[in-house]
Interface confidence: medium
Amino acid sequence: MMTGTIETTGNISAEKGGSIILQCHLSSTTAQVTQVNWEQQDQLLAICNADLGWHISPSFKDRVAPGPGLGLTLQSLTVNDTGEYFCIYHTYPDGTYTGRIFLEVLESSVAEHGARFQIP
């Protein structure tokens, strides 16, 4: 039975040209995390594998950095980065947990700075 829950940063915003940390946290389970996939819509951004470490998709290598932890840092943000991001936790024996984050990249300097994991 899947008992775990994923906490995410929820809806966050950041300024164009800036950076943001996408963070998920799996709790309430003793399942072993074997791999975390980060996706934007259905496009794979990065993977953190327990055995093999980090892999960043070639098309995002210049703008995506691994970490902190199992999180993902997006850099040089553009308005096109606005949208849904998913953290997909592969665990054993529970199965797969998915968390959702919505990022809005703003043109102006009115981005909310309240998000816990946002980089100033």
């Epitope: 072993q32 074997t34 794979l44 993977i47 055995d51 093999l52 054993y92």
Partner: antibody, heavy 121, light 107 residues
Framework: QVPLVESGGGLVRPGGSLRLSCAAS????????MSWIRQAPGKGLEWVSY????????YSADSVKGRFTVSRDNAKSSLLLHMNSLRAEDTAIYYC??????????????WGQGTLVTVSS | DIQMTQSPSSLSASVGDRVTITCRAS??????LTWYQQKPGKAPKLLIY???SLQSGVPSRFSGSGSGTDFTLTISSLQPEDFATYYC?????????FGQGTKLEIK
């Protein structure tokens, strides 16, 4: 050259044991997750077990949990399946298969030719 | 566990036909869907991964589409060597699960 070759299948009585081997060649074995997948005669495919590249993480289907153990020897590029307390319903062709690679977990690009396990009295 | 259901279970078609096989997942698997081809007495062969990516060496007449719970495999113009059994498999979560197969036969 076939990159995966299974061996060790045969006829065994119910309750008996068997050890299947899969010899890998032509790729860096230690970089890949590996699986055992079986197919009963005339039936579909059933995933059996899975092992991470280092061998530190092992997964098993509920139908074989506690009876089958998967292991690997990266120095010898070999995958093993120890099968205990065999039942008639374990009769199948057993394939070893390679995970496609980083980011494509649970998707299998290389398969062996299979080895037949028959459990019968 | 995630259940995979294929339809039809068997299909008769002629060389040159366009054929579509469908696969439905019991829950959202995003794009984590794989298609295999199996010929009698042979091991399965990977055709399509992540729903629409063509495996290297697979002819371009094979294509895959879909996301979420509904997926399709299309063969644009059947060739004699395409008559085989086709399986879908969800690669989203352990335990991996396969569809029951679709046997493609010559009409």
């Amino acid at each position: 050259q076939v990159p995966l070759v299974e061996s060790g299948g045969g006829l065994v009585r119910p309750g008996g044991s068997l050890r299947l081997s899969c010899a890998a060649s032509g790729f860096t074995f230690s970089d890949y997750y590996m699986s055992w997948i079986r197919q009963a005669p005339g039936k579909g495919l059933e995933w059996v077990s899975y092992i991470s590249s280092s061998g530190s993480t092992v997964y098993s289907a509920d139908s074989v949990k506690g009876r089958f153990t998967v292991s690997r020897d990266n120095a010898k590029s070999s995958l093993l399946l120890h099968m205990n307390s065999l039942r008639a319903e374990d009769t199948a062709i057993y394939y070893c298969a390679r995970d496609r690679g980083f980011g494509e977990s649970y998707c299998f690009d290389y398969w062996g030719q299979g080895t037949l396990v028959t459990v019968s009295s | 566990d995630i259940q995979m259901t294929q339809s039809p279970s068997s299909l008769s078609a002629s060389v040159g036909d366009r054929v579509t096989i469908t696969c439905r997942a019991s829950q959202n698997i995003r794009s984590y869907l794989t298609w295999y081809q199996q010929k009698p007495g042979k091991a399965p062969k990977l055709l399509i991964y992540t729903a629409s990516s063509l495996q290297s060496g697979v002819p371009s007449r094979f294509s895959g589409s879909g996301s979420g719970t509904d997926f399709t495999l299309t063969i644009s113009s059947l060739q004699p060597e395409d008559f085989a059994t086709y399986y879908c498999q969800q690669s989203y979560s352990i335990p991996c699960s396969f569809g029951q197969g679709t046997k493609l036969e010559i009409k």
